[in-house]
């Protein structure tokens, strides 16, 4: 069964996926798709890497970790209820039927709005948690808290750039 991950509406969701590349310049193609992993490839691809680059992604999806070291964990920005569902991380190891497939279930909960909510945001167990501060008007800076593959908690500031929702394709 799928491993379950949770986030609240308006937060960033984090879906972990890792492998160990032979070298930083000798990577394995990876695809992320919405829906369970099919027999081949990924369905409804939201992000794809090749042996060197992230060569396809859509606007709210990006890699939080260093994909050159095999951290291909997916971040989905500003999630809505429609982002709920199964996601497939597929490590496309060369050879017949060698792919590693991971189905991750994302559960989006409605945002909790309470009169007692403080400037530090909601402290529920949703991952990642965010502390958002306005900066320069057009950007906000968000403290993203997540757990890496060693179980270590990581906090990092991430600029939430507001985009037009377009699809970006390289190459």
């Amino acid at each position: 069964s799928e491993v379950e991950y949770r986030a609240e509406v308006g937060q960033n969701a984090y879906l972990p996926c890792f492998y160990t590349p032979a070298a930083p310049g000798n990577l394995v193609p990876v695809c992320w798709g919405k829906g369970a992993c099919p027999v081949f490839e990924c369905g409804n691809v939201v992000l794809r890497t090749d042996e060197r680059d992230v060569n396809y992604w859509t606007s709210r999806y990006w890699l939080n970790g260093d994909f050159r070291k095999g951290d291909v964990s997916l971040t989905i920005e500003n999630v809505t209820l429609a982002d709920s569902g199964i996601y497939c991380c597929r490590i496309q190891i060369p050879g017949i039927m060698n792919d590693e497939k991971f189905n991750l279930k994302l559960v989006i909960k409605p945002a909790k709005v309470t009169p007692a909510q403080t400037a530090h945001g909601d402290s529920t167990t949703a991952s990642p948690r965010t502390l958002t501060t306005e900066r320069n008007g057009s950007e906000t800076q968000t403290l993203v808290t997540l757990h890496n593959n060693n179980g270590t908690k990581i906090s990092t500031w991430a600029d939430e750039i507001k985009d037009s929702g377009e699809t970006i394709r390289i190459g």
Epitope: P24, G25, D53, D66, R68
Partner: antibody, heavy 121, light 107 residues
Framework: QVQLQESGPGLVKPSETLSLTCTVS??????????WNWIRQPPGKGLEWIGY???????NYNPSLKSRVTISLDTSKNQFSLKLSSVTAADTAVYYC?????????????WGQGTLVTVSS | EIVLTQSPATLSLSPGERATLSCRAS??????LAWYQQKPGQAPRLLIY???NRATGIPARFSGSGSGTDFTLTISSLEPEDFAVYYC?????????FGQGTKLEIK
């Protein structure tokens, strides 16, 4: 427009540690997808990639320098830093900071102006 | 690591002439080769990436070609501001490496 600016001592004594900082302005510093690199150029010679740091803190170094290099990040100041230990005269160079993006890995689209570091007693 | 050899070391031409700079890799780098321009006292500037793609804001007189081990940077008609040092760089194999440069000087 992204801008990078190197700063640090222009003179370092042999066997000591070279320390430089790169300040990034104009956005993108703490955004996933961008890698922050150090590259150097000895006088009259070609360029050599030293290493990178990703905004998550992940680092990677050129094998030829790995034992002496540390690159670190200060996201609160939009800065990343280079430390090169046990320097010799061969480390005299102009040191550049530069950016690349994971859509075109190791293609350096923005550079700082560079700072000359001389190793001499 | 991959060694990039640039030739000639120095190229002397006049404004308006065509410049052809060469970069040869010690093993195939597919099309993963970039070209940079560097003027005295300035940082390198990305001109061409992945062998033939012009970077943002680069004039059309700059073009790149080649694949595998042999690559060419061509400047169709030299402008006074084009006289500089040009470097090639590969990103096919880690670590990324640069050539030693070609100095393009006014004849």
């Amino acid at each position: 427009q992204v801008q990078l600016q190197e700063s640090g001592p222009g003179l370092v004594k042999p066997s000591e540690t070279l320390s430089l900082t790169c300040t990034v302005s104009g956005g993108s510093f703490s955004r996933g997808g961008y890698y922050w690199n150090w590259i150097r150029q000895p006088p009259g010679k070609g360029l050599e990639w030293i290493g990178y740091i990703y905004y998550s803190g992940s680092t990677n170094y050129n094998p030829s320098l790995k034992s002496r290099v540390t690159i670190s990040l200060d996201t609160s100041k939009n800065q990343f830093s280079l430390k090169l230990s046990s320097v010799t005269a061969a480390d005299t160079a102009v040191y550049y900071c530069a950016r690349d993006h994971y859509s075109s890995s190791w293609t350096f689209d923005y550079w700082g102006q560079g700072t000359l570091v001389t190793v001499s007693s | 690591e991959i060694v990039l050899t640039q030739s000639p070391a120095t190229l002397s031409l006049s404004p308006g002439e065509r410049a052809t700079l060469s970069c040869r890799a010690s093993q195939s780098v597919s099309s993963y080769l970039a070209w940079y321009q560097q003027k005295p006292g300035q940082a390198p500037r990305l001109l061409i990436y992945d062998a033939s793609n012009r970077a943002t804001g680069i004039p059309a007189r700059f073009s790149g070609s080649g694949s595998g081990t042999d690559f060419t940077l061509t400047i169709s008609s030299l402008e006074p501001e084009d006289f500089a040092v040009y470097y090639c760089q590969q990103r096919s194999n880690w670590p990324p490496t640069f050539g030693q440069g070609t100095k393009l000087e006014i004849k």
